[in-house]
Interface confidence: low
């Protein structure tokens, strides 16, 4: 029914739609959501609203990053009596609608999952029409993305006095633990230094100086799995060739 | 008339379990989160956990995660929890009530007892 | 957990007495979003299970005489009752509506002289 109030504050008449039980919006999401890179994700989004019987146009969008302020993933528009939700917006083709607004369920597939992808995300509605409201998710979800280690970066680096260094750059979620062997190094692998977190998911060893040639390894392992590669240093005339 | 019928009065052995029934009614049950509420005698209320009938999503206060299991049969609008493993700390007043805790069950009283 | 402390734990009034009685928070209910505090009050009458009166710390629920005030901000929050009727006299709890657990104040009891 519709019930209309007397706004004190103001002096205004304001007729808003009201149905018990649910007299206020509310969005309910989980904490956070796991899954691995390359495979799907399905973020459960549902809401209450005091609009029980609303049907007319609304629209879907999900943000990342922050919420009403974060860049928009997704979003799709209903119109008026239908539970169909057009797809307006889908970044990259691989965001997809799977819950029905109709039904108060914004839930989110996300295909192809990759590391960029690790970040919170919103979920928010608006009504159109004869009711204009919206509300969005103030917590989101957390979208916690695993990956495999993968080297993505091994070389051999001039250092100061004609001395030479190696680097080694993995990315992995957990973050990859990195060791180097090779020769002097002993026969077990040997992280000469701590590694370093760096930027986002990615994680960098260094051996800090190469005292003979031969073949370095770089082997970057987490609870997912290992990875691993290889340069060559062999010196002549001071110059160094890095193969991997 | 949206309303919550709660199951009568139990009394229980120790050690045993217990299955409280909640049936709704005068509203779209799949669309509204049911919550559970404990109160013992003479002390306040605890929220033990919710159940989203629509989806069987659940949450659940940590303190009562292993003692309490949420379901919702949606045929005959019935949101049930089940206490396992009950010892008198378990003795108390149990209501079942709508999300924003709007509309509330009568409760049903549950006694531990020898 | 957030934590709800109520105060004080009884009160003793005459009708038609002016009553104040408090709920503090230990981390702030207010919503940046929508700048609502989550904070909602119940009644409870021996025998009866809780009645919504306050949500959003000061939005009274239909039904719900206007005697009944709710106010504050954050983490310190308060109910008004302007004139005590006899019909008022139960047990106040605040609660915690921002985020999981739900949690409940211990309680104000509201007796009669």
């Known amino acids: 029914f519709v019930r209309t109030k007397i706004d004190t504050t103001e002096n205004l008449l304001n007729t808003e739609v009201h149905s018990s039980p649910a007299q206020r919006w509310s969005m309910q999401v989980p904490p956070e959501v796991s899954a691995e890179a390359g495979d799907a994700a399905v973020l459960p989004c549902t809401f209450t609203h005091p609009h029980r019987h609303y049907d007319g146009p609304l629209t879907a969008i999900w943000r990342a990053g922050e919420p009403y302020a974060g860049p928009q993933v997704f979003r799709c528009a209903a119109a008026r009596g239908s539970e169909l939700c057009q797809t307006a917006l889908s970044l990259h083709g691989r965001f997809r609608l799977l819950g029905n607004p109709r039904r108060n369920d914004l839930s989110l597939r996300v295909e192809r999952l990759a590391l960029a992808d690790d970040r919170r995300y919103f979920c928010r509605v608006e009504f159109a029409g004869d009711v204009h409201d919206r509300y969005e998710s103030r917590h989101g979800v957390r979208l916690h993305v695993t990956a495999a280690p993968r080297i993505v970066n091994i070389s051999v680096l001039p250092s100061p006095a004609h001395a030479f260094r190696a680097l080694c750059t993995a990315e992995g979620e957990p973050p990859p633990a990195l060791a180097w062997s090779g020769p002097a190094l002993g026969n077990s692998l040997a992280a000469v230094r701590s590694p370093r977190e760096g930027h986002g998911h990615l994680v960098t060893a260094e051996l800090p100086a190469l005292t003979h040639d031969g073949r370095y390894t770089c082997t970057a392992a987490n609870s997912l799995g290992r990875s691993e590669a290889s340069v060559y240093l062999f010196r002549f005339h001071g110059a160094s060739g890095a193969s991997t | 008339q949206v309303q919550l019928k709660q199951s009568g009065a139990e009394l229980v052995r120790p050690g045993a379990s217990v299955k409280l029934s909640c049936r709704a009614s005068g509203y779209t049950f799949t669309d509204f989160y049911i919550n559970w509420v404990k109160q013992r005698p003479g002390q306040g209320l605890e929220w033990i956990a919710r159940i989203y009938p629509g989806s069987d999503e659940t949450y659940y206060n940590e303190k009562f995660k292993d003692k309490v299991t949420l379901t919702a049969e949606k045929s005959s609008s019935t949101a049930y929890m089940q206490l396992s493993s009950l010892t008198s700390e378990d003795s108390a007043v149990y209501f079942c009530?709508?999300?924003?805790?709007?509309?509330w069950g009568t409760g049903t009283t549950v006694t531990v007892s020898s | 957990d957030i934590v709800m402390t109520q105060s004080p734990s009884s009160l003793t009034v005459t009708a038609g007495e002016k009553v104040t009685m408090s709920c503090k928070s230990n981390q702030s209910l207010l919503n940046s979003g929508d700048q609502k505090n989550y904070l909602t009050w119940y009644q409870q009458k021996p025998g009866q299970p809780p009645k919504l009166l306050i949500y959003w710390a000061s939005t009274r629920e239909s039904g719900v005489p206007d005697r009944f005030t709710g106010s504050g901000s954050g983490t310190d929050f308060t109910l008004t009752i302007s004139s005590v009727q006899a019909e008022d006299l139960a047990i106040y709890y605040c609660?915690?509506?921002?985020?999981?657990?739900?949690?409940f104040g211990a309680g104000t009891k509201l007796e009669l002289k």
């Open positions: 609660q915690n509506d921002y985020s999981y657990p739900l949690t």
């Open positions: 009530a709508l999300w924003f805790f709007d509309v």
